[in-house]
């Protein structure tokens, strides 16, 4: 199915806004810059989430699935 991943309406995609606090969903809060898809070599970088590339820094970051936290969405959020 072409839409098997979380739909953009619900996955926190807008967390890329330069002035938005993204601590809940990305590896850094108030991260500046723009995003693209992570290169293929990062296919499994995010354990429970979607990888996106910080264009200006050329580094991967993760948008975690609901209920997961951590730099690579590797930890269950006990407060979820």
């Amino acid at each position: 199915d072409g839409n098997s991943t979380r739909s953009p309406e619900t996955n926190g995609l807008l967390c890329g806004d330069p002035d938005e606090n993204c601590a809940a969903t990305t590896t850094q809060s108030k991260r500046k810059g723009h995003f693209s898809r992570c290169p293929k070599q990062y296919k499994h970088y995010c354990i429970k989430g979607r990888c996106r590339f910080v264009v200006t820094e050329q580094t991967p970051s993760c948008v975690c699935d609901e209920g997961y936290i951590g730099a690579r969405c590797e930890r269950v959020d006990l407060f979820y």
């Epitope: 072409g2 839409n3 991943t5 953009p8 309406e9 996955n11 995609l13 807008l14 890329g16 806004d17 330069p18 723009h34 995003f35 693209s36 898809r37 992570c38 290169p39 293929k40 070599q41 979607r50 996106r52 590339f53 264009v55």
Partner: antibody, heavy 119, light 107 residues
Framework: QVQLLESGGGLVQPGGSLRLSCAAS????????MSWVRQAPGKGLEWVSG???????TYTDSVKGRFTISRDNSKNTLYLQMNSLRAEDTAVYYC?????????????WGQGTLVTVSS | SYELTQPLSVSVALGQTARITCSGD??????VHWYQQKPGQAPVLVIY???DRPSGIPERFSGSNSGNTATLTISRAQAGDEADYYC?????????FGGGTKLTVLG
Amino acid sequence: QVQLLESGGGLVQPGGSLRLSCAASGFTFSSYAMSWVRQAPGKGLEWVSGLGHVGYTTYTDSVKGRFTISRDNSKNTLYLQMNSLRAEDTAVYYCARDYLDFGYYFDVWGQGTLVTVSS
Amino acid sequence: SYELTQPLSVSVALGQTARITCSGDKIGKKYVHWYQQKPGQAPVLVIYDDSDRPSGIPERFSGSNSGNTATLTISRAQAGDEADYYCQAWDMQSVVFGGGTKLTVLG
């Protein structure tokens, strides 16, 4: 249903300008990156420009400095301002939705609008 | 800049298997997507991420990607499969398309 509808194409002289519009419906327009892709008569597809959901823009080399991509999320509309048009810009221009961020694939396309640059 | 090379045309007999290739330097390290375009119509995504099929695309369409070549395979080719097919990848913050392949279904 999810739909993209381009408009604004037509005949323009070399050196002239044109603004294309792409009206989106059936999805949360502001959440998606969008792109323009063109196809010259009898030729293949050529990506022209892309615009991220937070304003990041990127262009193919041949249109840099001449074309400007923009969006109005309140109107669910994508634009392509084309200046200093050349004969080689003659093509059908398609508006396409990038799946999620840049770097994915185009999962929704409009039907295209024809731009003809000729004297 | 990155280039994707496709054969200009491929012919297949009705009911047989067609294979369309897309060549590029270390293309296996990139995600490759395939679009079908019929005359006078907009392109339609038929394969994404090398081998995944969007909903509504028949199982006869499949893809693979390794080394320097990505391949779109169309099994049990039908007359309605006759179209132009384009591969696409992402390189250095820009989109790259192959030149396109015209698939002709014979018989």
